[in-house]
């Protein structure tokens, strides 16, 4: 009686069991009574990569580059080539047929993991302790600064997208400003002691002058580079000195229109 | 139903070629299978002579040297058997044959 | 070339009784892929030789089931389980596992 089923790697025809062709080779003949299935190998640009009774060898896919894909590995008889995104892309499919552009992790994520030819960037949020302020296909989230390292406190607080101020701590803070202060009293006592020199060297006019106003004093009469006919300088909130415009009277103004 | 039917002359002179014709109906000789030439001595003796594949590649007896051509036409299903240079040792009953079908066998004999 | 022996030329039984018929070859018929393309061949008297059995053990089409083959690569048997008036005739064995295909002398099969 005929075969209802063959062995493996065989297969059923005209109530026989053909030998099936090899990976490589394409069916040519089926096996008869008398004679083997007859097979011949696929050609260069061609591949089957099963045992087979098929007619016509498989064309090897093309790895086009205006779709942003190169060979990753050339076909053979056997197995078909594989194709990959070139640089900077990765496969939109499977089949990697197209290529499209790794996606950025946003600030505030991180890369888990970086993307390759076939699988995209894959992003993570920057848990505490951690930040990304940065939008970027390669960057981990990282790690806040640590102040104490530094032998600072920390003035801000870092975010998911920001890192941490640090700033000086307090011994540091007073060491730096008590010098300050101590310099600035030490100016302005120098001046007063100035000063007081300047009131007890002036001898007192004896003089009368009965008619004449209380004249105003000006301490700075003496000072290297002062005019006394100079009108006095205005200042401004930021101690800045302003020089008097010409032209114009020495008096506190009404805001001047623009 | 796959049939073979043969066809030629029965008297060859020695030194002459022999030519004889296979019709096959039922199937085409281009499909599959390897199409055979056959003789049969007196006394029952079988001798495989050659064959023309499906493809039209061929494969003889080298016993038969270089006197022996199979050819065949596609358009009309035949396939053809020449022998050259006969002589009477030739003298054998010739049968066409995919193997599991055979013509009805062409007795052939060499004489002057 | 492989040489095929049939060593029983005449074998004589009588009806009902079992046939075994016996072809030796001078070398293994087993190709590479494992099948023994060896065929056995019934020629009836005035007729031309008709399938029986190929590749060792496989009936052809319309074949008995009384018929069946056996054997390895180089012994190979048919066997008529039941021998029947209309089973006389002259059998052949042929291999086309190698080329030159050969057949075997023949063996005839006589009713007592």
């Known amino acids: 009686e005929p075969p209802t089923a063959c062995r493996e790697k065989q297969y059923l025809i005209n109530s026989q069991c053909c030998s099936l062709c090899q990976p490589g080779q394409k069916l040519v003949s089926d096996c008869t009574e008398f004679t083997e299935t007859e097979c011949l190998p696929c050609s260069e640009s061609e591949f089957l990569d099963t045992w087979n009774r098929e007619t016509r060898c498989h064309q090897h896919k093309y790895c086009d580059p205006n779709l942003g894909l190169r060979v990753q590995q050339k076909g053979t008889s056997e197995t078909d080539t594989i194709c990959t995104c070139e640089e900077g892309l990765h496969c939109m499919s499977e089949s990697c047929e197209s290529c499209v552009p790794h996606r950025s992790c946003l600030p505030g994520f991180g890369v888990k993991q970086i993307a390759t030819g076939v699988s995209d960037t894959i992003c993570e949020p920057c848990p505490v302790g951690f930040f990304s302020n940065v939008s970027s296909a390669f960057e981990k989230c990282r790690p806040w600064t640590s102040c104490e390292t530094k032998d600072l406190v920390v003035q801000q607080a870092g975010t998911n997208k920001t890192d941490v101020v640090c700033g000086p701590q307090d011994r540091q803070r007073a060491l730096v400003v008590i010098p300050i202060c101590l310099g600035i009293l030490f100016v302005i006592l120098l001046l007063v002691l100035v000063f007081i020199k300047k009131v007890a060297k002036k001898p007192n006019d004896k003089a009368p002058h009965p008619k004449q106003e209380p004249q105003e004093i000006n301490f700075l009469d003496d000072l290297p580079g002062s005019n006394p006919a100079a009108p006095v300088q205005e200042t401004l909130h930021g101690c800045q000195p302003v020089t008097q415009e010409d032209g114009k009277e020495s008096r506190i103004s009404v805001q001047e229109r623009q | 139903e796959v049939q073979l039917e043969q066809s030629g002359p029965g008297l060859v002179k020695p030194s002459q070629s022999l030519s004889l014709t296979c019709s096959v109906t039922?199937?085409?000789?281009?499909?599959?299978?390897?199409w055979n030439w056959i003789r049969q001595f007196p006394g029952n003796k079988l001798e495989w002579m050659g064959y023309?594949?499906?493809?039209?590649?061929?494969n003889y007896n080298p016993s038969l040297k270089n006197r022996i051509s199979i050819t065949r036409d596609t358009s009309k299903n035949q396939f053809f058997l020449k022998l050259n240079s006969v002589t009477t040792e030739d003298t054998a009953t010739y049968y066409c044959a995919r193997l599991d079908y055979w013509g009805q066998g062409t007795s052939v004999t060499v004489s002057s | 070339d492989i040489v095929l022996t049939q060593s029983t030329l005449s074998l004589s039984v009588s009806l009902g009784d079992q046939a075994s018929i016996s072809c030796r070859s001078s070398q293994s018929l087993e190709n590479s892929n494992g099948n023994t393309f060896l065929n056995w061949f019934l020629q009836k008297p005035g007729q031309s030789p008709q399938l029986l059995i190929y590749k060792v053990s496989n009936r052809f089409s319309g074949v008995l089931d009384r018929f069946s083959g056996t054997g390895s690569g180089t012994d190979l048997t048919l066997t008529i389980s039941r021998v029947e008036a209309e089973d006389l005739g002259v059998y052949f064995c042929l291999q086309v596992t190698h080329v030159p295909f050969t057949f075997g002398s023949g063996t005839k099969l006589e009713i007592k």
């Open positions: 039922g199937y085409s000789i281009t499909t599959n299978y390897h």
């Open positions: 023309i594949k499906y493809d039209g590649s061929n």
